[in-house]
């Protein structure tokens, strides 16, 4: 059993090394942003025992604008990068807890809160996820639009468009 691709977090990137059960991955806030104190960038592939479906835990990560960069003069256009990330050290303890960011948390109204988009379900043969409080649990709608659709979607109830003879298995394995 493996996890599907994890959900995205605003102003953060993640490079997934392993989709195996119990693997842990870390989001990295994009350049110009930093991890808000008290939030965690970690996500773990866990098993919903009720449904035997693996999913990523929901990270509490919020990437906020780095106050240290607010008053800096913009770099010349030739040196500006748009896909850069700012690694931020965090310890990976067995308990999954990690130290808060070094800078104090403030009520910065300009701070950008993370909008978490649920991860994808790439195991259509699995039954819908139930009995979990994890936001990141995955529900399979078996070819019909999910009840929890992303905002502004306006779709007909037509069947999925899938390449002939190819199905969205992703990194999932059936056991």
């Amino acid at each position: 059993i493996t996890c599907p691709p994890p959900m995205s977090v605003e102003h953060a990137d993640i490079w997934v090394k392993s989709y195996s059960l119990y693997s842990r991955e870390r989001y990295i806030c994009n350049s110009g942003f930093k991890r808000k104190a008290g939030t965690s960038s970690l996500t773990e592939c866990v098993l919903n025992k009720a449904t035997n479906v693996a999913h990523w835990t929901t990270p509490s990560l919020k990437c906020i604008r780095d106050p240290a960069l607010v008053h800096q003069r913009p770099a010349p256009p030739s040196t500006v990068t748009t896909a850069g990330v700012t690694p931020q050290p965090e310890s990976l303890s067995p308990s999954g807890k990690e130290p808060a960011a070094s800078s104090p948390s403030s009520n910065n109204t300009a701070a950008t809160t993370a909008a978490i988009v649920p991860g994808s379900q790439l195991m259509p043969s699995k039954s819908p996820s139930t009995g979990t409080t994890e936001i990141s649990s995955h529900e399979s709608s078996h070819g019909t639009p999910s009840q929890t659709t992303a905002k502004n979607w306006e779709l007909t109830a037509s069947a999925s468009h899938q390449p002939p003879g190819v199905y969205p298995q992703g990194h999932s394995d059936t056991t």
Epitope: S8, V9, E10, H11, A12, D13, I14, N30, A115, V117, P118, G119, S120, Q121, L122, P124, H138, E139, S140, S141, G143, P145, S146, Q147, T148, T149, A150, K151, N152, W153, E154, L155, T156, S160, H161, P168
Partner: nanobody, 117 residues
Framework: EVQLVESGGGLVQAGDSLRLSCIAS????????MGWFRQAPGNEREFVAS????????VYDDSVKGRFTISRDNAKNTVYLQMNSLKPEDTAAYYC??????????WGQGTQVTVSS
Amino acid sequence: EVQLVESGGGLVQAGDSLRLSCIASGRTLSYPDMGWFRQAPGNEREFVASINWSGTGRVYDDSVKGRFTISRDNAKNTVYLQMNSLKPEDTAAYYCAARVGTEFQYWGQGTQVTVSS
């Protein structure tokens, strides 16, 4: 109904670059998470990258780290996959997918990328 049409594939040499495009159309006001997957002959389809609606959150498979970049232009309803430093093992059919709610549900027909050594 949502239609996804990929383009930009082709035959290139190892080390070259390609940019794939995926144009989304249909009865939609805006698009949520979009992603790219690939499938080599005889292999399962595998995840490559995805991007959220605002374009600020990206997820990549570690195998493409530092080489592939996903981006989107909502004004053009287009998602891009910039592929640099291509390797023979990147040879596959590349599929664009749109996430509805919690799953990637809409799929394009794919575009073939072949990297020769």
